[in-house]
Structures are given as structure tokens and as C-alpha cells.
Amino acid sequence: MEDFNMESDSFEDFWKGEDLSNYSYSSTLPPFLLDAAPCEPESLEINKYFVVIIYALVFLLSLLGNSLVMLVILYSRVGRSVTDVYLLNLALADLLFALTLPIWAASKVNGWIFGTFLCKVVSLLKEVNFYSGILLLACISVDRYLAIVHATRTLTQKRYLVKFICLSIWGLSLLLALPVLLFRRTVYSSNVSPACYEDMGNNTANWRMLLRILPQSFGFIVPLLIMLFCYGFTLRTLFKAHMGQKHRAMRVIFAVVLIFLLCWLPYNLVLLADTLMRTQVIQETCERRNHIDRALDATEILGILHSCLNPLIYAFIGQKFRHGLLKILAIHGLISKDSLPKDSRPSFVGSSSGHTSTTL
């Protein structure tokens, strides 16, 4: 029996030197054999250990930063504004997500070795963090809109209502993340590493798309439109009225929203393209699939990075956060009281002036 090269580089090489005139039922190499080719994943040129290092850094920064943010807000009980309460919840969401990062990091190296329970819990925390984040930012935008555009000492000034809104946001976030809790499990396959993803039997692909489209619409696009509407009008009002003080006060909130969008919009746009491809709205080809997969890898890192960025924004832009932190340090004798700024007020993100509440 004739030997042949199992690692032949191409069909042409494979057939080279053959006496094709004796070929039993075709005298030429059929062209469609060239389409019997593999679609090989072109992994992103980021070493998986480099990704693990990023995850570790984000974990440490997020743990430290969000703990400090929560500490400062909780300490400043007297002048705590509505926005403070929303930002407190935002920090809590980021902190909860950060706690799952070591598990995600380990799964990048070894596949999903943690079983179905952790697969569900960790995935749920990731989803809840994302949805509560954008919903809280939408609420802040509505609060700023009412305070600045309509100059109302808004309904949300009533503490029980703010608490109710925050609880509703957590509830809605859980609802939007429910598909993950219900359908995610550890999937074991004989020839690939175990993975943590949605498994719905024979209809997995269709269900996965439906359960991705619904939360993407209600959990990302709708709050995004609310934010654009509210901040559009808020900015217009500020510029028209030359409200310099309030304009300065909006800097941190705008920075928070901008960073959120910079971190999560790319991932969601790529996810949308992926959804369109998997539902065959856009034709899926090997090249496109590889582009999408690499883009998902890269933009997911951006999204994960977001959980440690808000405290940095407060630290570098938010004057009152710095003051609040210094105050806590002074209270505990870690720094001299003399080093406190003269105008150091107890509130982390703002005070009320007249009918409006300025933030940061």
C-alpha cells in the first residue's frame, strides 16, 4: 500500500506526482475539494497569561477603589445626595463583579473547571453588574435632568423612593440576567476544554439569540437612549443659562457616563454583530467569525476594566471624594486635621442648592 503524507500542506501538494490519468472516476482534482477546508480560530495575539495579569490588576484596583468609594459615601451621611446613593449602588455592583474576576482569570487558562453552580453564580454577577450599572446611570441622568432642566427638588429627594428605585434596579437587573441563571451550565465535550455557556438542548442557538436580543434591547439600548435624551437637554440648559457652578458639578457624572460608554459600547456593538451573524441576518464566514471572536476578546477586556475605573474618576475629577477620603483619614488619625481643605464638606457627591442638587 502506498504511503502518503498526513501533514500535506495543500491539496495540490497532496496530489502532486500522482498519475491522475489512471484515476478511477475523475481525471482532475475536483475544485470543491478546496472547500473541504478547516476554519481555524485565529486567537487574539494576546497571551492568555497577559489577560490573567490584567484581570488580577483590575481585581485589586476594583477591590480597593470601590471599597473606598462605599466607605466615603457611607461616612458622609449628613449631606448625602440622591446621586450619592446611586453611585454607592454602582460601587457595590462593581465590587461584587470584581470578586468573580479570579475565577474568570483561572478559566482563561484551564477552561471552566468550577462546575455548574459557580458557572451560574459568577455569570449572574457579571450580567447583574452590567445591567445595574447602566440602569443606575440612566437614573442619575433622569435625576440630573429633573434637577437642572426642570429645576425641581425631585421626587427622588424622598429617601424611601430612592431606596425603592435602587431595589427596583437590582430586581430588574436580576430579571434581565435570569436567562444566564437558568440556562448556563458547564458543558463538557470529549475534544475541547469544559466551558461555561448557555445550553438549551437542540434549540440552543435559537434560544441563545433570543435571550441575548431581549436583554441587549431593554438592558442596554433603552437606558442608553434615556441617558442621551436627559444629558442632551441637561447640557443644553447648562450652556444656555451659563450655569458655571452646575456645569462644573456635572463633570464627574459626564466622565462616569463617558467611561461607561467607552468600555461597554464596543463590546455591545460587537455582540450585536455576533447576534446578527448567528441569526443569519449577516452571512457567517470563517473570516468574519474570526474577526468577531477576536473583537469580542478585546472588547471584553475593556468591559472588565470598567469595574475599576469609576473610583479613579472620582479620585482625579471629584473634588468632594478626595475631601471625603481625607476626612475619614483625619478622623482615624492617619493624617493631620490641618491638612484638610478649608471647604471640605461631608457630602461625597454634592449638596442641594435651592431646588436643584448639584453633583460633584
Epitope: 495543500s10 470543491f32 473541504a36 477546508a37 478547516p38 476554519c39 481555524e40 457567517e284 470563517c286 474570526n290
Partner: nanobody, 111 residues
């Protein structure tokens, strides 16, 4: 790295059936094409059936109507269902995608 592992070969009586499997790893399975080849003792290797990237099926004349190529995306496995087997179908059957080859599985059809 792409790996292909065939199974399902064996000894069968003429007129009988066999199902060959080719488990693949290291590729985006649903977007990959593949081909089944065979090589009988003292003969040239020949393609038997092809499943292209876009899902089109092709069969060599001697096996048309008897062999069926299929795939299971959930299990990353290709299949070759061989019915009405003839002694001339005796060969080592290989699954192939691009430059990657399985180790082969022996099919022997006795008369």
C-alpha cells in the same frame, strides 16, 4: 492545533452497513468543510465524499446513493454512513480537512 480522530471501522458482510465518525478539535467546526478519503491496498487514494464549508455535499460516482456524509455541530463530529457495502469498498478510510488528516480506520467488506 487541529486534530481529527476517526472511529467506527470494522469487518462487515457485503450488503451490510457501517457508520464512520470523525471527531474534530481545534477548529470552528460549523464553518469547516471536510472530506472522506479511502485507500485500498495497491490502489491510489481517492476522495469518497465531501462536505464543503457552505454545507454542499458531493459524492464520488461509485458511492452515490449508498454513502451519506453528515455533521453534528454540537458534538464537533462528522459522519459517513455507508450502506449496501461492497467488497470493493474495503480500504482504510481517512477524514480530512485542509492539511489535516485523521489516523484512518480500516473497513473490510467480506463477500
Amino acid at each position: 492545533e487541529v486534530q481529527l480522530v476517526e472511529s467506527g471501522g470494522g469487518l462487515v458482510q457485503a450488503g451490510g452497513s457501517l457508520s464512520l465518525s470523525c471527531a474534530a478539535s481545534g477548529l470552528i467546526f460549523r464553518l469547516s468543510g471536510m472530506a472522506w478519503y479511502r485507500q485500498a491496498p495497491g490502489r491510489q487514494r481517492e476522495w469518497v465524499a465531501v462536505l464543503t464549508k457552505d454545507g454542499t455535499l458531493h459524492y464520488a460516482d461509485p458511492v452515490k446513493g449508498r454513502f451519506t456524509i453528515s455533521r453534528n455541530n454540537a458534538e464537533n463530529t462528522w459522519y459517513l454512513q455507508m450502506n449496501s457495502l461492497k467488497p470493493e469498498d474495503t480500504a482504510i478510510y481517512y477524514c480530512n480537512t485542509g492539511r489535516y488528516w485523521g489516523q484512518g480506520t480500516q473497513v473490510t467488506v467480506s463477500s
